[in-house]
Structure formats: C-alpha cells, structure tokens
Amino acid sequence: KVILDKYYFLCGQPLHFIPRKQLCDGELDCPLGEDEEHCVKSFPEGPAVAVRLSKDRSTLQVLDSATGNWFSACFDNFTEALAETACRQMGYSSKPTFRAVEIGPDQDLDVVEITENSQELRMRNSSGPCLSGSLVSLHCLACGKSLKTPRVVGVEEASVDSWPWQVSIQYDKQHVCGGSILDPHWVLTAAHCFRKHTDVFNWKVRAGSDKLGSFPSLAVAKIIIIEFNPMYPKDNDIALMKLQFPLTFSGTVRPICLPFFDEELTPATPLWIIGWGFTKQNGGKMSDILLQASVQVIDSTRCNADDAYQGEVTEKMMCAGIPEGGVDTCQGDSGGPLMYQSDQWHVVGIVSWGYGCGGPSTPGVYTKVSAYLNWIYNVWKAEL
C-alpha cells in the first residue's frame, strides 16, 4: 500500500493506477481528469479590494470606486456589522475588534461616515462632518503576539514560543521550505517552493515546534500561487496554502499579522529572520533546530548597485541583511517570514532568493508582502 501510494495514483471510473509523476503534468491521464485536479493553482491579481488598513493605528480606509480616491472611516455610527463586512471584504472570517481613535493632526485623507451596500462598505452619501472626531481602528484577527521576545544578537537557536507562526512545509516528509501562519486556514510561503512538485497530495505542514520532524503533520487542501510573470521570473514569489482543517491556536501555534498597506520600512530598520535552512552556503545540511537572526532593511538602490543585484530587485521585493554580510537566510529557509515588530509582529517579507548566502554586497532578497495584500485578500475572499 505504501509503495503503491508513493509511486502510483489511483484513477476512478474505471479504477486503474497511473505513475505518480503523471500527476499535475498538464495532461489528463485519468478519464475524468482527477490527476490534474489537486494541483498548485494560479490565481490572478484580481480587482482592487475597496478597504484597507493603515499603519496609523490600524485605521480603516475605504475606496470610492467612482473617483479612485481613498477616505478614512469616521467612527460615527460604526457598528460591529460594518466591522465584519470590512473584514469579510479582506477575506477574514474571524470576529473583528474595533475601537475609536482620535483624528490625528497629520490626517491627510478626508474623513467620511461609512454605510453598507450589498455586503461592501460604502461612503454615506450625505456624509457631514465627523462628529465624534474619531477614526475606526480595526483588527480583523488577533495576531502577531508571542509568548517570548527574542534577544537582539547575531544568530542563535530559536524557541517556538518566540515564533509560534513558523511552520515547516514538507514534501514526502522532507523539509523543503518555511512558512507563516496567517489565520486558522492559511499559511503564507514562497511560490518557488512548489516548482518541482505541483501535486498537493504529498505536501504537509508542520506547526508548533522548533525542532524539525518532531510534530504532527497537517494535510493541505489547496496551494495557490499568483500568475507567473515571464518578464520578471523572480517576481510574484508568493503562495498561500489552505489547510484541510483549521488550526487550533495555542501558545505555540499562532498567526502573524499581515503588514499594513503603507508599511514602508526605511533602510536600517531592524527585522528578524528564522528558519531551518542551511547554516553555511552549500553547507549540505538543514539545521534540526530553528535558528533566528536579527537583520536590517537594506536600501533598494544599494541592493541594485552594479556590485550587487544590478537592477534585478523590483518594487515588489525588498532586501535585508547586515551591511558587512555574514547573517542571511539560505537554502531551506525559503518561504519563511521576514518580520518586523511594532505593536505586533508583521510578516513584511517572504524569503525568496539571493546570490549565495551572507555575502556583503548580495543580501537576502524577499518578496514584499505589502505589494501582494490585494492578491491575498482576493484569494481569501474567493475561498470564504
């Protein structure tokens, strides 16, 4: 049975086996085509989601689709139902929390009262002044809190208490990539992790431990990537894995927050990386223990210089490392989070690519998560 499962796939009607390598090869080898059903699927970027959250205290902004202008949501008459609608528009199914926060002196958007129309937030037509003088601060999911705060040092062994959102993504029980829990159903990782194996069956997620292989594996229902851009093959290195059953959150299994749409991190901002990847370039072996390291944002201009990536780092990517080199993500860390701590931890990047590991002029290159928020929300909405 185990040998059969490893090398063959059972087609139905009529029942017969086909070699497993024929799964997800673009050819219908089973009469009903089920060999092409449970495969990595691509999902287009989709339309602009008409709500977003700002780094200014997680305040809610709403798009006026007629003009293309964004407005801040006034707290006047804002209800739990409106909060749920806003979060559902971003694909969340959990119960949101919201509160009033004072309109700040730097408020640059017009403030409008919000209403609902066919399950979408709208601006109230006859919106007068914002009487409460407050904006809506909205949290769609409790995220980004860990039991333990890491110490700021170079590279050290990590505890799952510090990084309860970190998962190991495994194919045939072998660790391939890292990933981050975003909510009970969804894990964020890199698309390039699935380049070799596009069948969903053999992929598993392991959560809740800092040791490789010491925790139960979770079945995967779907793997979704963004459409490939043949003009920038390294762009769009992002994937969402939908778990077959929702996770139960605990001290060691928790979600990390998505970044705010306007999360622009300046050079030298401190960030963290974690993973079970190679500890040396071409080091040949994964680390059994989760490792963590502090790095910093490296300016894109510097990263694109002639002695570095020569313009290959696009606006949808970011660089992080340390100026003198030596601390970096490496093979096996791919898909894992690049993290920033404000009030909560946010996954601002996904370990994507780089030349070598830890070189001074070629730091790690990460998928910039804020560039893909729209895509993430559209995927989630489609799967609600």
């Epitope: 459409e227 490939f228 851009n229 003009m231 093959p233 313009g311 696009t314 606006e315």
Partner: antibody, heavy 117, light 107 residues
C-alpha cells in the same frame, strides 16, 4: 561578447510549419530566459512567448497557444521556435531576445518568414 | 491584456531639439515599463528599463520617467542617429505588450 544568431529566411506554404533557431554565445546560456517577438511588415512588435533554457519551461501568448512550440538544446546553446499551421498573416520577422531585468537587452538579427502559396 | 498607447504616432524634429514621447497604460503598471529604439531592418535596442533606468551603453541624453499609467521618454538634444521608431513595453503582467510605436523623423 553576447550574441544571438538566428537561422536564415524561410518561405513556406500555408498550412506548413517553420522552425527558427537562435544560437546564444558570450554568456551562460542557462542563466537567462529567451523570449520570441515577431514583427509583421510595417507593423509593431508582438510578443509570442518565453522559454527557460535552464528548466525547459515555456509559456506562450494566448494567440499562439496550440500552434507554437519552443524547445532548447543546451549542448549547443540553441533555442528553437516552431510555428505550425502557417497562414499569410504569419508573414513577419521573428526575433529571439534575451531577458534581463524585465527588458530584452540582446536581440537576434531576426528571421524573415514568408508565407505564400 | 494591458493596452499600451503611444503618442504621437509620428513626430518631426530637428537635430538639437528636445523631444518627448508619451506612453499610457490601460491600467496601473507601477514602474514596469521599458523603452526601445528600432531602426529600419534592425532589431530593437533597449534604451530604458524599469521606467527610468538607463540601459548600459545608452547615451545619457535619453531619459525616462513616470509611474502608474503615464510614462515619458525624453531625448534632451536630438542627434542624427536618433531618428528611428520608439516603442514602449509593459512588463508588469503577462502577456507583455508593446505600444504601437512613435516614428521620429527629420524635419
């Protein structure tokens, strides 16, 4: 220096196929994607598809899906583009081009394919 | 597919003139835009990538600007060898698409 050298001009009958080659030199062949772009006489540029010489992966423009096939031979650093079921509208200069940073930095000299009965 | 529209379609200018060609995308493409120059019987030549980055070996009189939907190619002081057809091309989303071209002729 980097060069992409294409095969010579071809005259084909409607319904036939044509296979254009593009030989790369002066750089690591497997490190850069190759794209194909065509230009009908007096017209603009039209993208046809891409190939990764490293993995052999390909992708084609919707318009050419089912009619175009791109292959490569790593031993000779050559990429091929085959277009089948030719019609008169396929008369054009066909270019291969190397992709760098989202743009085509080196182009072949072009291959004129004439489809005529 | 993303449509790219260039203006003008043709343009007459003299040596030494400052020339501007514009390109508009049917939707936002950030700065994922390239400019090419093509002379009769020759393959196109990459001038500008990522909207404003000058390709190696291209004279500094060529410059590109813009982001989102509106882009500009500027030649600060036309030289005799600059008379050619210019194409913009978006690389934001597949399939990559080209503008219809702007023919720059001697006045």
């Amino acid at each position: 220096q980097v060069q992409l050298v294409q095969s010579g001009a071809e005259v084909k009958k409607p319904g036939a196929s044509v296979k254009v080659s593009c030989k790369a030199s002066g750089y690591t062949f497997t490190s850069y994607y190759i794209h194909w772009v065509r230009q009908a006489p007096g017209q603009g540029l039209e993208w046809m598809g891409w190939m990764s010489p490293n993995s052999g992966d390909t992708g084609y423009a919707q318009k050419f899906q089912g009619r175009v096939t791109m292959t490569r031979d790593t031993s000779t650093s050559t990429v091929y583009m085959e277009l089948s079921s030719l019609r008169s509208e396929d008369t054009a200069v066909y270019y291969c081009a190397r992709l760098v940073r989202g743009g085509f930095d080196y182009w072949g000299q072009g291959t004129l394919v004439t489809v005529s009965s | 597919d993303i449509q790219m529209t260039q203006s003008p379609s043709s343009l007459s200018a003299s040596v030494g003139d400052r020339v501007t060609i514009t390109c508009r995308a049917s939707q936002g493409i950030s700065s994922y835009l390239n400019w090419y120059q093509q002379k009769p019987g020759k393959a196109p030549k990459l001038l500008i990538y990522a909207a404003s980055r000058l390709q190696s070996g291209v004279p500094s009189r060529f410059s590109g600007s813009g982001s989102g939907t509106d882009f500009t190619l500027t030649i600060s002081s036309l030289q005799p060898e600059d008379f050619a057809t210019y194409y913009c091309q978006q690389s934001y989303r597949s399939p990559p698409t080209f503008g219809q071209g702007t023919k720059l002729e001697i006045k």
